[in-house]
């Protein structure tokens, strides 16, 4: 290996003054060939039996043990910059006349080849006695990733000879590998932030802030935890990484307390049925904690209702929930509230809601359906439903006729404003059984329908009636 | 090569206030931090506290808490005493010292020329 | 806070002869690292401090090996070997061990 030595930015004059290693004459004119990877040999020179890679005659095994042994000579071994510096340094070798066979050098780093455009020159001092070959290596503005062990190789009469390492050492600022990162915290709840800041130059010693003042006057070397025993409120963290370069400071992270959410805002009612609403809701600020679930509550918002709120559970997403089972027609209000790990936040403000007009509850009572022959038609009378408020307002009626007969089969209906309480149709189909079913309407859908009433449909004028399947109390009917 | 170069000498009442300056050349500004240190007539020299030169983030020793402020103008890489309520007993000559903790602790490596404050009604 | 306390005062000297400044201090100024930050600061007349020697015994770049320290503990010493002409002048020991940063009271070290 070389003397270790610490320089900066050294010149090539510097470097490579006065006599080279061996024993070449001061004004021995070298020649240079750059490169940008593979170092070639130059051409051939007097005094060199064969030129560099061409074959050469092959030495008896015998004739090459009695070759002189050839090594690198020594340089430098440990070079020690700044950052952003320019550094050159160098291999160099003497190559007897004797040693037939010679390959170019070649710079290597931590054991890998460097290829590509790197900047180095060999240059060539022949004399009599063979050649001495100094390869020249720079780096312009040095960066950490230049740190490393850099080394010559050449093949030699097929022997690989390889140099000391020079071991470039770029020192800087310290750098972070791990810096605090944003926690949420639970109040007076202890926590661990991480900093860690690497050379060279080591060591690196770190200080932390929190909210601009200093937590420890004392350093911590790299890597440093600091346990925080508890917040009552945000605060920043960071931390200041020192060498003997100088100093950084990490990014600055807030360090935030959980606290239960805000209450969630913009409730609003995306659809009403008659019996359920769809609502939904922009969530509050989530207190630095996820929302968990929500919750929505209804109260009727009549008079005369007693005030119990009902409660429907969801989860937090998404902002939507379709509150069911509600009362036809009637008015609500609703606000929702949200949770996190910490706690319930307050109600959103209420917001009125109503429901819409339900479907009649109760089929038309009291069916009777009788045959005009004369006329061809089926007579139809019913009574209106007993239809409560919230049913709507009733505004006809739909009535339903199956025709059966062998072979045929037709459904059909009708719908008839609600003037009246009686319908006529047309025969379809003789000698067939039609079945009659009659549903109230009102805005808020079609009610049930009634149970069936059948009529036999005769060929001719003979007539079999049944009665309505919803006979009035104490009534029976009969044609 | 670093140099701290440091404002004038300063003649100022009691109750007044001064803000002392100290210009860094030769170096990145915010890569270190400046110390202050006080030398009062035909005394010692008292560590006042420092700054640190990236994040301003400041630490004063206890005798110099309240009435004393270090402050910076990165843009213009000066660091900035401010005295507020000047006594006679603040009479001193102001040093700024360049300053972080190397592998030796605290470095003072570089040091201004010294600002003379001089409080007399 | 840490006391520094040095001694003597005064130091006249004769050029070429040795001085000895001693600086004590209140505390041990050993840290849990094992490094002990006790460091010397010249101030020629009429200049501003330099930085002289840290870590008890190492000289900053610049600084002749006439000058030495040693010490631990509590107990430090500097030395210079032949005092010459530009050493004339006060030094303070500092230590940066504790918070807050301390000096002597400083030596006025000058030629008989």
């Known amino acids: 290996g070389g003397t270790a030595e610490k320089w900066e930015e050294t010149e090539l004059d510097q470097l490579f003054s006065g006599p080279l290693p061996g024993r070449l004459p001061v004004n021995h004119r070298p020649f240079s060939a750059p490169h940008s990877s593979r170092d070639q040999l130059p051409p051939p020179q007097t005094g060199r039996s064969h030129p560099a890679h061409t074959a050469a005659p092959q030495v008896t095994s015998t004739a090459s043990k009695l070759l002189p042994p050839v090594a690198f000579n020594h340089t430098i071994g440990h070079i020690v910059l700044s950052e952003h510096k320019n550094v050159k340094f160098n291999c160099s070798i003497n190559i007897p006349n004797t040693y037939q066979e010679t390959a170019g050098i070649s710079w290597w780093k931590d054991g890998k080849e460097l290829l590509g455009a790197h900047h180095s020159i060999t240059q060539f001092y022949p004399d009599e006695e063979g050649v001495s070959i100094i390869a020249l290596f720079s780096i312009a503005s040095v960066q950490r990733s230049d740190n490393g062990s850099y080394f010559c190789k050449m093949k030699v009469n097929n022997r690989e000879i390889v140099s000391d390492p020079i071991y470039v050492e770029v020192q800087g600022l310290p750098y972070f590998i791990k810096q605090p990162e944003s926690v949420n915290v639970t109040r007076n709840t202890a926590f661990n932030l991480t900093c860690q800041a690497v050379g060279p130059p080591e060591p690196v010693n770190i200080f932390w802030v929190q909210n601009s003042s200093r937590v420890n006057e004392k350093p911590e070397r790299s890597p440093s935890v600091l346990t925080v025993p508890g917040l009552t409120e945000t605060a920043v963290f960071s931390c200041e990484a020192h060498n003997d370069k100088g100093l950084t400071v990490s990014k600055g992270v807030h360090i935030n307390i959980k606290v239960i959410p805000s209450p969630p805002t913009e409730v609003h009612i995306l659809n009403s049925t008659a019996h359920s609403i769809l609502v939904s809701w922009v969530p509050g600020f989530d207190g630095y904690s996820p929302l968990q679930n929500c919750s929505i509550q209804v109260k009727e918002a009549d008079r005369l209702s007693n005030g119990s709120v009902m409660v429907f559970n969801t989860s937090a997403s998404p902002h939507l929930y379709e509150i069911q089972q509600l009362q036809a027609l009637a008015n609500y209000s609703i606000a929702v509230s949200c949770r996190n790990e910490i706690g319930w936040s307050a109600v959103s403000p209420w917001i009125l809601a109503s429901t819409t007009e339900g479907a009649p509850s109760v089929a038309p009572l009291n069916i009777t359906v009788f045959l005009n022959e004369s006329n061809n038609i089926l007579d139809i009378r019913w009574t209106k439903p007993p239809i409560k408020r919230q049913d709507g307002e009733l505004v006809g009626y739909r009535i339903s006729h199956v025709w059966e007969s062998a072979g045929t089969y037709k459904e059909l209906s009708e719908e008839v404003s609600q003037n009246g309480s009686w319908a006529q149709i047309p025969v379809q189909i003789h000698n067939a059984t039609c079945t009659v079913r009659i549903a109230a309407i009102t805005k808020g859908g079609i009610g049930p329908f009634s149970e069936p009433v059948n009529i036999i449909i005769p060929e001719h004028s003979k007539v079999d009636y049944a009665p309505s399947s919803t006979p009035a109390p104490g009534n029976t009917d009969s044609m | 090569q670093v140099q701290l170069v440091q404002s004038g000498s300063e003649l100022k009442k009691p109750g007044a206030s001064v803000k002392v300056s100290c210009k860094a050349s030769?170096?990145?500004?915010?890569?270190?931090?400046m110390s202050w240190v006080r030398q009062a007539p035909g005394q010692g020299l008292e560590w006042m506290g420092w700054?640190?030169?990236?994040?301003?983030?400041?630490t004063y020793a206890d005798d110099f808490k309240g009435r004393f402020v270090f402050s910076l103008d990165t843009s213009v890489s000066t660091a900035y005493l401010q005295i507020s309520s000047l006594k006679a007993e603040d009479t001193a000559v102001y040093y700024c010292?360049?300053?972080?903790?190397?592998?030796?602790?605290?470095?003072?490596?570089?040091w201004g020329q010294g600002t003379t404050v001089t409080v007399s009604s | 806070d840490v006391v520094m306390t040095q001694s003597p005062l005064s130091l006249p000297v004769t050029l070429g002869q040795p001085a000895s400044i001693s600086c004590k201090s209140s505390?041990?100024?050993?840290?849990?690292?094992?490094?002990?930050?006790l460091n010397w600061l010249q101030q020629r007349p009429g200049q501003s401090p330099r930085r002289l020697m840290y870590?008890?015994?190492k000289l900053d770049s610049g600084v002749p090996d006439r000058f030495s320290g040693s010490g631990s503990g509590t107990d430090f010493t500097l030395k210079i070997s032949r005092v010459e002409a530009e050493d004339v002048g006060v030094y303070y020991c500092?230590?940066?061990?504790?918070?807050?940063?301390?000096f002597g009271g400083g030596t006025k070290v000058e030629i008989k």
């Open positions: 500092w230590q940066g061990t504790h918070f807050p940063r301390t």
């Open positions: 700054i640190n030169n990236y994040s301003g983030v400041s």
């Open positions: 505390q041990s100024l050993l840290d849990s690292e094992g490094k002990t930050y």
């Open positions: 030769g170096n990145t500004f915010t890569t270190y931090g």
């Open positions: 010292a360049r300053d972080y903790y190397g592998s030796g602790g605290w470095v003072f490596d570089y």
């Open positions: 870590l008890v015994s």
